[in-house]
């Protein structure tokens, strides 16, 4: 018995179906095919779970969180024992193993391994200003999304004709911050943060209004 090499890793957007491949060759009839799909979740690597099983001509459900979402792609028994996972969740991310036995065909490689990564587009980021908005001050524009896999990068832009940040601004696209030093009236305006990753983008807006000093009355 020989389980074929798998593609190694599969990526899927959250909520979309995933197909985890596993095929094998055997010299025996499929009378006592035994297939066990297990997952080692990324979120709990020391707690492997059963996903779905086929034993003695019967199908068995795995862990309750997979109920109603998982099945074999074809009619069992077969040499293609790939499975689908519908409505993928972030918690489905992990390393999946198919263990195949088909007596009396023993020996060979009976395990196939496939990684599954469930991707999540950035959630609507939260924009805020840190620091005094008085003229001449330094301010930091903050942007962060609670969700996003892979981790989003953040791009700040000023919504004017140029879409460029003020010359005194420095941007950190990983942290999602923009530091604007020595703000002036020209620094005022609408700023947009664009959070993006491999499967999506999301934005938030922030209105920076630089406060000019009030003229003092001379008594």
């Amino acid at each position: 018995l020989e389980v074929s090499e798998s593609p190694g890793s599969i990526q899927v957007a959250r909520g979309q179906p995933a197909v985890l491949p596993c095929t094998f060759t055997t010299s025996a009839a499929l009378i006592n095919l035994n297939v066990i799909w297990m997952v080692t979740p990324l979120s709990n690597a020391n707690q492997p779970e059963q996903v779905i099983l086929y034993q003695g001509g019967q199908m068995f459900d795995g862990a309750p969180r997979f109920h109603g979402r998982v099945g074999f792609t074809g009619t069992m028994p077969a040499t293609n024992v790939s499975i689908f996972i519908n409505n993928t969740q972030l918690s489905d991310t992990g390393t999946y193993q198919c263990l195949v036995n088909n007596l009396p065909d023993i020996g060979g490689r009976n395990i196939g391994v496939t990684g599954l990564t469930v991707l999540v587009p950035p959630s609507a980021p939260h924009c805020q200003i840190q620091g005094s908005q008085d003229i001449g001050s330094d301010v930091i524009l903050l942007c962060s999304s609670e969700e996003g896999i892979p981790r989003p990068t953040y791009l700040w832009e000023k919504l004017d004709n140029t879409l460029k940040l003020p010359p005194t601004a420095t941007q950190d696209q990983v942290q999602g911050t923009v530091t604007i030093r020595n703000i002036s009236a020209l620094s005022s305006g609408l700023y947009q943060c664009v959070a993006s990753n491999a499967i999506g983008t999301s934005t938030c807006l922030l209105d920076l209004q630089v406060i000019s000093p009030q003229p003092r009355n001379i008594g």
Partner: antibody, heavy 126, light 107 residues
Framework: EVQLVESGGGLVKPGGSLRLSCAAS????????MNWVRQAPGKGLEWVSS????????YYADSVKGRFTISRDNAKNSLYLQMNSLRAEDTAVYYC???????????????????WGQGTMVTVSS | EIVLTQSPSSLSASVGDRVTITCRAS??????LNWYQLKPGKAPKLLIY???ILQSGVPSRFSGSGSGTDFTLTISSLQPEDFAAYYC?????????FGQGTKLEIK
Amino acid sequence: EVQLVESGGGLVKPGGSLRLSCAASGFTFSSYSMNWVRQAPGKGLEWVSSISSSSSYIYYADSVKGRFTISRDNAKNSLYLQMNSLRAEDTAVYYCARGQLLWFGESALIDAFDIWGQGTMVTVSS
Amino acid sequence: EIVLTQSPSSLSASVGDRVTITCRASQSISSYLNWYQLKPGKAPKLLIYAASILQSGVPSRFSGSGSGTDFTLTISSLQPEDFAAYYCQQSYSTPRTFGQGTKLEIK
């Protein structure tokens, strides 16, 4: 204490119907496949039907296919067997049994009936 | 369907005796065989699974062996509570089938 208690047995005429129930307690019912097994008077055990934990997969013995329906309600920790078109040869003690998947060897599993109820008697007679 | 044939159908023995019950399958079932104990009015009990593995809580005087088509259940030293019916069952294929049973009686 892990327990299965069957109910609903009784005397019924040929062609009649009966619904058996099995109440589970002491374990996470929704995580296990469940089975009905019967024993006719003076005879051996006969597997009747099985249902997976989510009800996605259901199997029947040929002798009852098309007449019996297995179902479960995980919220109520209950297993059921609806028996229609009953025949004299369906007379038996009906047991519900939990299906347990047990590891052996390096990567092999076997299913076994690891917890049983005490049974309920079904008599089909005119 | 796989047919399991148990022998003997009944057997008389005394407390302290060593008893062996055999189960023969109509085709090879590897180690996919379980043994159960049945007592009247009580819930049946799983004794051994996968031909030779003792189920948790079952006394060590019970043992199982065999593979392929021939299997045995052995009780090394009979105790009063062991007088019951014993059944083998295969999980190699569907439908799951049982042997016809062996009734163990007090001599």
